[in-house]
């Protein structure tokens, strides 16, 4: 495939990545699948600078990111290492809270109204952000 050199229509370019901000809500798994179908992934936050960029675009709205611990350890969807990476949890989070009564704890991370992160029930229909890197091989065939 060819290398993607500019962002698709309706995506926002920032620091050699492209971002798409939803205006509707989906469960985390559905949001994850949506991004994958776009040859992208749920946003992976690797720096304070990227955090501020995303925060600016989403506003004070609960929004899924590409971080979950559904299999035990916290994992970023693109394989970025959680342990050594950037973190911006709210105080006392993540708490894997069971008190919601919906079954299970809280296994998916989202931006809260102040931008800091919280873990929540993955089935909640929050907005989401997709990210794809420029210069990575595109799935589309090259133009001849």
């Amino acid at each position: 495939g060819s290398e993607r050199t500019c962002c698709p229509v309706n995506w926002v370019e920032h620091e050699r990545s492209c971002y798409w901000f939803s205006r509707s809500g989906k469960a985390w798994a559905d949001a994850d699948n949506y991004c994958r179908l776009e040859d992208a992934h749920l946003v992976v936050v690797t720096s304070w600078e990227e955090q501020k960029f995303v925060q600016h675009h989403i506003g004070p709205v609960n929004t899924w990111m590409g971080l979950h611990d559904q299999n035990g350890p916290w994992k970023w969807v693109d394989g970025t290492d959680y342990e050594t990476g950037f973190k911006n949890w709210r105080p006392e989070q993540p708490d894997d809270w069971y008190g919601h009564g919906l079954g299970g704890g809280e296994d998916c991370a989202h931006f809260t109204d102040d931008g800091r992160w919280n873990d929540d029930v993955c089935q909640r229909p929050y907005r989401w952000v997709c990210e794809t890197e420029l210069d990575k091989a595109s799935q589309e065939p090259p133009l001849l």
Partner: antibody
Framework: EVQLVESGGGLVKPGGSLRLSCAAS????????MNWFRQAPGKGLEWVSS????????YYADSVKGRFTISRDNAENSLYLQMNSLRAEDTAVYYC?????WGQGTLVTVSS | DIQMTQSPSSLSASVGDRVTITCRAS??????LAWFQQKPGKAPKSLIS???SLQSGVPSKFSGSGSGTEFTLTISSLQPEDFATYYC?????????FGGGTKVEIK
């Protein structure tokens, strides 16, 4: 590499107390709910207690409620289980565990 | 409390056999189910979480399926190192509960 190392087990008389410790390493301890499980000799697995990363959400099995206290020190990457009013039926190997990873366990024997 | 019923409690099988262990929950638990393997004198080892997600480093001969109240663990081709006791555990709600275990022995 994720590691959980329990300590503090031993022989104690009925009615006595014991404090188990679990030293965690290789992961961001404060990001994880932690549990204590136990296994009596020749028996199956039993959950004992659970504590959220910030200690705000705690649960106990009915069999230990009012006698055992779970706590953690995120600065020290440590999990604790204070066991009071011990009974013979508390005799077991006690395991410290994250959802996906268990320590090797420490044996607690309650006998006169 | 949610009761977890595992069957069989023990089974004898030969190397190369396909083995299936069943776990039934007393109420629906979605896919909040884990499978553990335990060998004598050792700590339980996590094999599968969320009913079907293989833990990192666990060989693909292990697979899990199910949702709601019925779950299965399958070992596609039993190897000598697989002879152990297997437990299911629900983490849908507290108290966390386990099945009684299935001891897989050499025939």
């Amino acid at each position: 590499e994720v590691q959980l190392v329990e300590s503090g087990g031993g022989l104690v008389k009925p009615g006595g107390s014991l404090r188990l410790s679990c030293a965690a390493s290789g992961f961001t301890f404060s990001s994880y709910r932690m549990n204590w499980f136990r296994q009596a000799p020749g028996k199956g697995l039993e959950w004992v207690s659970s504590i959220s990363g910030s200690s705000t959400d705690i649960y106990y099995a009915d069999s230990v409620k009012g006698r055992f206290t779970i706590s953690r020190d995120n600065a020290e990457n440590s999990l604790y289980l204070q066991m009071n009013s011990l009974r013979a039926e508390d005799t077991a190997v006690y395991y410290c565990a994250r959802r996906d990873f268990w320590g090797q366990g420490t044996l607690v024997t309650v006998s006169s | 409390d949610i009761q977890m019923t595992q069957s069989p409690s023990s089974l004898s099988a030969s190397v190369g056999d396909r083995v299936t262990i069943t776990c039934r929950a007393s109420q629906a638990i979605n896919t909040y189910l884990a499978w553990f393997q335990q060998k004598p004198g050792k700590a339980p080892k996590s094999l599968i979480s969320a009913a079907s997600s293989l833990q990192s480093g666990v060989p693909s001969k292990f697979s899990g399926s199910g949702s709601g109240t019925e779950f299965t663990l399958t070992i596609s081709s039993l190897q000598p190192e697989d002879f152990a006791t297997y437990y299911c555990q629900q983490y849908y709600s507290y108290p966390l509960t386990f099945g009684g275990g299935t001891k897989v022995e050499i025939k």
